[in-house]
């Protein structure tokens, strides 16, 4: 599989980690989260050309079948391979509590 | 999150398991696999509308930000949540061997 920087579509166009700034309102969290007021959301965005960052055998199959039947089988998709944890200060009935979420921010990406 | 059958886009249009019949030639495996000659490839295909089969918090965030910034943030993508193993009879220099692959056939799907 090609490495993360070797994108045949041009620099930065293939599957990679992006950061999107979002407020609590943007995320629909304003009613249950107190802090942070803004989050630097890391997510996986970009194209998955042939064998680029292929996660596994299934991704390789998908690439082959997409080439044969593009109307039936979609190309592999850029999704998180792992996550970074994040702590939220949440509103509760009586005040606030701390809650850590392990599946909130993408850490690195692959194609599947 | 909505269950797997409650697709707002119409029956069968949302993220779910599909079976695609593929030959060894289709898969590019003819030179190294002896059997099976044809595979019933199970894969995840379909749309991921708001909160449909959301895999985790990240998928929920992605839905919210896609709604706000559709040109920047893609919608969640339909990918395998787990896999079924599959055994292949592989050609070797001296004959054949059995090899089990754990990441080849999708077992069920979610949006991420």
């Amino acid at each position: 599989a090609r490495n993360g920087d070797d994108c045949p579509l041009g620099p930065g166009r293939c599957c990679r980690l992006h950061t999107v700034r979002a407020s609590l309102e943007d995320l629909g969290w304003a009613d249950w989260v107190l802090s942070p007021r803004e989050v630097q959301v890391t997510m996986c965005i970009g194209a998955c050309p042939s064998q680029f960052r292929a996660a596994n055998m299934h991704a390789q199959i998908k690439t082959s079948l997409h080439r044969l039947k593009p109307d039936t089988v979609p190309a592999p998709c850029c999704v998180p391979a792992s996550y970074n944890p994040m702590v939220l200060i949440q509103k509760t009935d009586t005040g606030v509590s701390l809650q850590t979420y392990d599946d909130l921010l993408a850490k690195d990406c692959h194609c599947i | 999150a909505r269950n797997g059958d409650d697709c707002p886009l119409g029956p069968g249009r949302c993220c779910r398991l599909h079976t695609v019949r593929a030959s060894l030639e289709d898969l590019g495996w003819a030179d190294w696999v002896l059997s099976p000659r044809e595979v019933q490839v199970t894969m995840c295909i379909g749309a991921c509308p708001s909160q449909f089969r959301a895999a985790n918090m990240h998928a929920q965030i992605k839905t919210s930000l896609h709604r706000l910034k559709p040109d920047t943030v893609p919608a969640p993508c339909c990918v395998p949540a787990s896999y079924n193993p599959m055994v292949l009879i592989q050609k070797t220099d001296t004959g054949v061997s059995l090899q089990t692959y754990d990441d080849l056939l999708a077992k069920d799907c979610h949006c991420i």
């Epitope: 944890p85 702590v87 200060i89 850590t100 | -």
Partner: antibody, heavy 118, light 107 residues
Amino acid sequence: QVQLQESGPGLLKPSQTLSLTCTVSGFSLSTYGMGVGWIRQPAGKGLEWLANIWWNDDKYYNSALKSRLTISKDTSKNQVSLKLSSVTAADTAVYYCAQEVYGWFAYWGQGTLVTVSS
Amino acid sequence: DIQMTQSPSTLSASVGDRVTITCKASQNVGTNVAWYQQKPGQPPKALIYSASYRYSGVPDRFSGSGSGTDFTLTISSLQAEDVAVYYCQQYNSYPLTFGQGTKLEIK
């Protein structure tokens, strides 16, 4: 559960460098939004914030002590270190490390007493 | 630096009394104020976040209010175990600063 444990030399001579370590458990120093802060308290006096370090390695220091302070972390060891150079008797205090979440000290260690005396 | 000034410095009250401690910031800090309780020989313990939100496990007799520059910590019915020093802290901007503390005693 969240725990923080300070360790230090106990006794130092004036002009020496104080080195403190905070070992944490129950949370990760790489968690977004998480930091560790150092606060000190001279006997019978109030709390004075010294420094903090965030998950992304951002560091902040008490403006009056900035030239003497250095904070660092080793995420793999779950440790945060603080160094205070050129100590004097005025630096005698109980030194606390605390879990800092978006500016707020949610959990505190038990503290370690540091005495500066010749 | 933002100064946080607490009053009174010492407060003596009876069990069952309503007790109020105030904290004044030298400039607007929004609602970015926390309150802590420190009992003798112990580290401080978080009570209130964001001026008015009680931390999980804190008894509901403790409440906080205020925004901008004026903040209040109230104990609705003082208990013997509330004997402690109480500190406010602003986290609106660095450097973080604490009030000088209010010592609460039982009459």
